[in-house]
Each structure stands twice: as structure tokens, then as C-alpha cells.
């Protein structure tokens, strides 16, 4: 079982839209999937949990902060929009 | 050399049932996602079908669903389209295509086989 | 669903000149996209994926590029193999759509 994320460290302007990939090797056909981020205050936060038939977001992620779920792919990707200052974190896609 | 040859086609009356073939050779079949397209008499291309190379995820566009079933041989290397309810806007050039691994862009297609929904 | 809006449908030129051909999907697809030649009677054949990757076998006179909701492929130095006609696909998610296609025609 493995996760990679392709996307390299990026600074983005704020207002834009960044699109964090993750992709996922696995012989369990419903996996459950994570993401998560760690801020410059080195808090620990859940952001996205997904499977095969439904996602959900932390509080803090209504409105801006979505997932792409290409089962086909095996992609969770995570979808950031508008992205503020205080989104800045390192970003980690588990499951 | 990938390899991927359809067969199945033909005349069928509106609401009747077909099954296409594709038989693959060349590669690991059992290895990789497979995809039913279609290209329309005036040359759209649709796609159709897909299913997981195990087997055990496949999916359809809303215009189909219900009406097509995918599967797969893999003993056999073969890919089918099991179709039904059959509608004159099916009536297409239908070719099987073969995926990269975990990805969705068609890496490989066959030479296609007409099917044809008239009265 | 997503669509896509190919343009222009279709496109006569001299071998030798360079074409531009458009795709527009109606979302970002993060340059999940992918084109395709036909030629007439043939199936189609992979040229370019994720965005701007060509296919193994593709001359490099081949081009592609773009990102968000707007892609093209372009081709240099038009050689007569190359006319026929030409197709953009997403793979953001299913369900998987097509441009409408461009037919390039020797003038």
C-alpha cells in the first residue's frame, strides 16, 4: 500500500486556487482517506475524510475547501478555493 | 504488440439486446483498466463503459446506465458490453480501449465494430 | 458533466503551415486532458497526455499546452500524415467527454 502526492511545496497568491494531488495504491476496494495538514504552529489538523460513496470536511473547510474523488484513478485530490494566509501548512494525504 | 479486436455488431431493432466482444492480446490483460467508446454517425465520440482491471469497479455515463453492463475475462482476455433497450441514438462505431495504469486517457484502441439500432 | 468546446470544427491548410487547435472545458480540469488523432477509416490514436505530454511514437512537430479550462494543441510544419481529424478528452472524474473534434483538410 502506498500514497503519493505530486504536488510540490507552493506559494500561491491569496484569493487563487490550488489543487494539492494525491493518488493511492491499495488492494482494498473502499479505503478510507485522510487529509490532513500541520500548521506553521506545528498544531496537528484533520481536514478531509473520504471513501468510495461520500466525503466530509472539518468545521473550518466549509465553503473553500473541497476533495476530488476519481475512484478510477485512485485520486483524492484536494481542492482549495479562494486560499487565505491562513491555509498555509504542510499538507499530507493518508489512508 | 497491444492488440484489441471487437466483435458483436450488427443490425438490431430498437429495444433489442447485443453483446460486443473485444479480445486482447499483447499485454497482461488482467493488469489494466479497460473502456467501451463510441464514435456517432456524425463522427462524436462517447465514452461508454469502464471497468477496473480486477474487475470490481465499473462505470457508466447516465446515458447508458442501466441499459449496458461491462465486464471482463480475465482467464479469457476478453472485455464485453453486454447491451440492452437498445435506442437508434446508439447506433455507433463501438471500440474497446485500453487505460495507462491509474490513469484515464485511452492508450490503446481496437479497430471497432458497428452497431447499428434500426426498424 | 463537463463539457468541452472544441474549436474551430474544422480547418483548411497547406502542408507546411502551423495550426493552432483550442479546447475549453466548462470547469478547471487541472490539465487532466488528453488529445487524439483519426484518420479516415482508422481508430483514434493517443498524441498528447495530461496536458502536455506526448504520446510514445508522436513527431515532435507536435505540441501541447495550456491549464484551468483552456488547452491546445498545436502542430508545426504541417506534414500530409497528419490531416485528419482531431479530438480533446478530459479524465477529471468520470464521466469522460469529448471535444466535438477538428477536421483539418488539405487545401
Known amino acids: 500500500d502506498k500514497v503519493t502526492q505530486s504536488s510540490p511545496d507552493q506559494t500561491v497568491a491569496s484569493g487563487s486556487e490550488v489543487v494539492l494531488l494525491c493518488t493511492y495504491d491499495t488492494v482494498y476496494s473502499n479505503p478510507d482517506l485522510f487529509w490532513y495538514r500541520i500548521r506553521p504552529d506545528y498544531s496537528f489538523q484533520f481536514v478531509f475524510y473520504g471513501d468510495n460513496s461520500r466525503s466530509e470536511g472539518a468545521d473550518f473547510t466549509q465553503g473553500r475547501f473541497s476533495v476530488k474523488h476519481i475512484l478510477t484513478q485512485k485520486a483524492f485530490h484536494l481542492v482549495i478555493s479562494p486560499v487565505r494566509t491562513e491555509d498555509s501548512a504542510t499538507y499530507y494525504c493518508a489512508f | 504488440e497491444v492488440k484489441l479486436v471487437e466483435s458483436g455488431g450488427g443490425l438490431v431493432q430498437p429495444g433489442g439486446s447485443l453483446k460486443l466482444s473485444c479480445a486482447a492480446s499483447g499485454f497482461t490483460f488482467s493488469s489494466y483498466a479497460m473502456s467501451w467508446v463510441r464514435q456517432t454517425p456524425e463522427k462524436r465520440l462517447e465514452w461508454v463503459a469502464y471497468?477496473?482491471?480486477?474487475?470490481?469497479?465499473?462505470y457508466y455515463p447516465d446515458t447508458v446506465e442501466g441499459r449496458f453492463t461491462i465486464s471482463r475475462d480475465n482467464a479469457k482476455n476478453t472485455l464485453y458490453l453486454q447491451m440492452s433497450s437498445l435506442k437508434s441514438e446508439d447506433t455507433a462505431m463501438y471500440y474497446c480501449?485500453?487505460?495507462?495504469?491509474?490513469?484515464?486517457?485511452?492508450?490503446?484502441w481496437g479497430q471497432g465494430t458497428l452497431v447499428t439500432v434500426s426498424a | 458533466d463537463i463539457q468541452m468546446t472544441q474549436s474551430p470544427a474544422s480547418l483548411s491548410v497547406s502542408v507546411g503551415e502551423t495550426v493552432t487547435i483550442t479546447c475549453r472545458a466548462s470547469?478547471?480540469?487541472?490539465?487532466?486532458l488528453a488529445w487524439y488523432q483519426q484518420k479516415q477509416g482508422k481508430s483514434p490514436q493517443l498524441l498528447v497526455y495530461a496536458a502536455t505530454n506526448l504520446a510514445d511514437g508522436v513527431p515532435s512537430r507536435f505540441s501541447g499546452s495550456g491549464s484551468g479550462t483552456q488547452y491546445s494543441l498545436k502542430i508545426n510544419s504541417l506534414q500530409s500524415e497528419d490531416f485528419g481529424s482531431y479530438y480533446c478528452q478530459h479524465f477529471w472524474g468520470t464521466p469522460y467527454t469529448f471535444g466535438g473534434g477538428t477536421k483539418l483538410e488539405i487545401k
Open positions: 470547469e478547471n480540469i487541472y490539465s487532466h
Open positions: 480501449a485500453r487505460h495507462p495504469p491509474m490513469n484515464d486517457w485511452f492508450l490503446y
Open positions: 471497468i477496473r482491471d480486477g474487475g470490481g469497479g465499473t
